[in-house]
């Protein structure tokens, strides 16, 4: 089968510092040396674009300065973390994979990872 | 809305040159494959080239490798097709598409006709 | 390159009628990656499927589309006089982007 698979897990609950991390695995059809990476958030059938990251295969991946996503790179492996989620980016995060260089492009979608993001409950007025 | 609209078409002699162009409008264009398929007349769709994102990759079809060259303007939002060396067989309705965020072909403009004849 | 197959090359109906186009993908590709297109003469191909089974946006529910790896099918459960056109099977997968050659549906 001509197609590129991605694998990335169902579920992940995000740190109460609003913090998520999770590994998407892509299994390579073909010898990419330049390699794209996008997480996507799908919630009430909208689609939005969270971050995107093109990489050299060997080097780190580099998202814009402003994104609120950071990552590294091991061989088909990617580490995503995604900071400064709360309660309302709860959401479906799918993964999307292209490779972009040499030819052939392939593309490779995930099906995706349910995060949990839970507002932390404000603490309390200490009387002292 | 998204929109899409080529221009540049028009009947051009063998081995001549021309350059189409699609302007669009009504989405991040820089967070988007552009593509160019073509269609004979009485014919089917034919993949020709895509240029991703940034500019920086572009892949086309076998038939038109070496004589066609994608670009884009990603701050005028445009992505032109330079075609060389022009032959009969070239002569298509000449289509620009939006590749969309899954990869299908989302958005498509109304074409421009190219027209190869001496 | 991928190459996609379609049967039959026309299909001659009665509005009313059910109709079931055929698209044999060579060598097998993921169902994510497969979408229908309608042709109407003079006018782009207009979005009807994507990753095989999912109606694109203000697509009438009389279509649907199913299939995996080698064999999809486009069917339009109650032909209407505007489904007569010309219908394409498009992978998306990998490059070189491959259609199939088109079937014609056309008024009995």
């Known amino acids: 089968c001509k197609a590129m698979h991605v694998a990335q897990p169902a579920v992940v609950l995000a740190s109460s510092r609003g913090i998520a991390s999770f590994v998407c695995e892509y299994a390579s059809p073909g010898k990419a040396t330049e390699v794209r990476v996008t997480v996507l958030r799908q919630a009430d059938s909208q689609v939005t674009e969270v971050c995107a990251a093109t990489y050299m295969m060997g080097n780190e991946l580099t998202f814009l300065d402003d994104s609120i996503c950071t990552g590294t790179s091991s061989g088909n492996q990617v580490n995503l973390t995604i900071q400064g989620l709360r309660a309302m980016d709860t959401g479906l995060y799918i993964c999307k994979v292209e490779l972009m260089y040499p030819p052939p492009y392939y593309l490779g979608i995930g099906n995706g990872t349910q995060i949990y993001v839970i507002d932390p409950e404000p603490c309390p007025d200490s009387d002292f | 809305q998204v929109q899409l609209v080529e221009s540049g078409g028009g009947v051009v002699q063998p081995g001549r040159s021309l350059r189409l162009s699609c302007a669009a409008s009504g989405f991040t264009f820089s967070s988007y494959g552009m593509h160019w398929v073509r269609q004979a007349p009485g014919k089917g769709l034919e993949w020709v080239a895509v240029i991703w994102y940034d500019g920086s990759n572009k892949h086309y079809a076998d038939s038109v490798k070496g004589r066609f060259t994608i670009s884009r303007d990603n701050y005028k939002k445009t992505v032109s097709l330079q075609v060389n060396s022009l032959r009969a067989e070239d002569t298509a309705v000449y289509y620009c598409?939006?590749?969309?965020?899954?990869?299908?072909?989302?958005?498509w403009g109304q074409g421009t006709l190219v027209t190869v004849s001496s | 390159e991928i190459v996609l197959t379609q049967s039959p090359g026309t299909l001659s109906l009665s509005p009313g009628e059910r109709a079931t186009l055929s698209c044999r993908a060579s060598p097998s590709i993921s169902s994510s990656y497969l979408a229908w297109y309608q042709q109407k003469p003079g006018q782009a191909p207009r979005l009807l499927i994507y990753?095989?089974?999912s109606r694109a946006t203000g697509i009438p529910d009389r279509f649907s589309g199913s299939g995996s790896g080698t064999d999809f099918t486009l069917t339009i459960s109650r032909l209407e006089p505007e489904d007569f056109a010309v219908y394409y099977c498009h992978q998306y997968g990998s490059s070189p982007f491959t259609f199939g050659p088109g079937t014609k549906v056309d008024i009995k």
């Open positions: 990753g095989a089974s």
């Open positions: 598409a939006r590749g969309g965020i899954w990869g299908y072909f989302d958005s």
